[in-house]
């Protein structure tokens, strides 16, 4: 949502968190700013004080329950608004009526894992952290890794179209020293995007046996 | 009903303090700001600060800082205003007005009906 | 601060007849969230304050619908589309888009 010279950007987690992103035109003075949440049919409300990220731009997280707890649903709203102090009242920056289910970002993959290394072969695992059980099988991956000499944006993207927590990683150099991240992101959702990519996993590939062709 | 109820006239000599109430009824007294509006005779309004009765915090227009303090009695639902080194200038009607904590929309929706505080010698 | 001024100081009126009242800022009074925070206020003789429009245009509850307001940036006017006797008064503008909030000076309205 934008207001005046500001952009107000929200994700939801899928389960109990709302990240938020406030930039604003013209640094504002040494003010103390919130996101607070309303939902439109739950009990509760939340605040969470805005932080400085750079310059023009602030970001928190509304933390809403228990880390694996589903706060929401498909059909709520939430009325999201940045407020800033001026003088003892507080002023509203920017709202909008957040949809969490049009706005998803799911946490990183977490416990990357080398199930099975060879020569030019590694199998690797991963888990979803946080992800509301509504998705059943609905989520896709992006996978990349990165080879010696080159950086992560030249390394291609590996796209898994299905909820598969695993990947065999081909045609690698015998003992070689690579990295590896996977990313998720659920089918739903008009502004749905993908999550931050996970921690890199490093290996190293087997070396090649001696006086064998390889 | 909103109502603001301000005490009675003040007279006081040049050096002198003024102490003004403002005892809020027919709303939440915690949930709304109450600002701090002076007219000196024959002339226009001056807003001169406000306090949140909720945490008490205040907030001071800079020509008035240093001599005037607002503060709030929650047990009562009142709200004082204090001028002190009073000078012929100060002489004026002084208002209180309800204000929303979040300024969405306006400033001051109900006002006192005026407290009027001369400074003579 | 922001220095409001008014036009003109006085207004005779004719009952029945519109009336406008204009209030200039001394900068441009648009909040950085993109909202106008221009209310207008109304004193009758004897009273306090009352509010009747605010956010420019915004009649607020219980004002007759003759008051309108209108402008941007720096310029604002408050219009009374047909003066009744119960008009009588001053009109003060009010900013509260900057701090300090500052009002205009006021426009005395009377019946010629």
């Known amino acids: 949502a934008v207001n005046g010279t500001s952009q107000f950007t929200c994700f939801y987690n899928s389960r109990a968190n709302i990240s938020c992103v406030w930039s604003q035109d013209g640094a504002l003075q040494d003010t103390s700013c919130q996101v607070h949440a309303w939902p439109d049919r739950r009990r509760w409300n939340q605040t969470c004080e805005l932080l400085p990220v750079s310059q023009a731009s602030w970001a928190c997280n509304l933390i809403l329950g228990a880390p694996d707890s589903q706060k929401l649903t498909t059909v709520d709203i939430v009325t999201l608004r940045v407020l800033c102090r001026e003088g003892v009242r507080w002023r509203v920056m920017a709202i909008q009526d957040f949809k969490p289910f049009e706005n998803l970002r799911l946490m990183a993959p977490i416990s990357l894992q080398v199930v099975h290394v060879e020569t030019h072969r590694c199998n690797i695992s991963w888990e979803i952290s946080q992800a509301s059980h509504y998705f059943e099988r609905h989520l896709e991956f992006e996978a990349r890794t990165l080879s010696p000499g080159h950086t992560w944006e030249e390394a291609p993207l590996l796209t898994l179209k299905q909820k598969q927590e695993w990947i065999c990683l081909e045609t690698l150099t015998p003992d070689t020293q690579y990295e590896f991240q996977v990313r998720v992101k659920p089918l739903q959702g008009e502004f749905t995007t993908w999550s931050p990519w996970s921690q890199p996993l490093a290996f190293r590939t087997k070396p090649a046996a001696l006086g064998k062709d390889t | 009903e909103v109502q603001l109820v301000q005490s009675g006239a003040e007279v006081k000599k040049p050096g002198a303090s003024v102490k003004v109430s403002c005892k809020a009824s027919?709303?939440?007294?915690?949930?709304?700001?109450i600002s701090w509006v002076r007219q000196a005779t024959g002339q226009g309004l001056e807003w001169m600060g406000e306090?949140?009765?909720?945490?008490?915090?205040?907030y001071y227009n800079e020509m008035f800082k240093g001599r005037v303090t607002m503060t709030r009695d929650t047990s009562i639902s009142t709200a004082y205003m204090e001028l002190s080194s009073l000078r012929s200038e100060d002489t004026a009607v002084y208002y209180c007005?309800?204000?929303?904590?979040?300024?969405?929309?306006?400033?001051?929706?109900?006002w006192g009906q005026g407290t009027t505080v001369t400074v003579s010698s | 601060d922001v220095v409001m001024t008014q036009s003109p100081l006085s207004l005779p009126v004719t009952l029945g007849q519109p009336a406008s009242i204009s209030c200039r800022s001394s900068q441009n009074i648009v909040h950085s969230n993109g909202n106008t925070y221009l209310e207008w206020y109304q004193q009758r003789p004897g009273q306090s304050p009352r509010l009747l429009i605010y956010?420019?245009?915004n009649r607020f509850s219980g004002v007759p619908d003759r008051f309108s307001g209108s402008g941007s940036g720096t310029d604002f006017t408050l219009k009374i589309s047909r003066v009744e006797a119960e008009d009588v008064g001053v009109y003060y503008c009010?900013?509260?888009?900057?701090?300090?909030?500052?009002f205009g000076g006021g426009t005395k309205v009377e019946i010629k």
């Open positions: 956010k420019v245009s």
């Open positions: 306090i949140y009765p909720g945490d008490g915090n205040t």
């Open positions: 007005a309800r204000g929303s904590y979040t300024y969405d929309n306006y400033a001051m929706d109900f």
């Open positions: 027919g709303y939440t007294f915690t949930d709304y700001v």
């Open positions: 009010f900013q509260g888009s900057h701090i300090p909030w500052t």
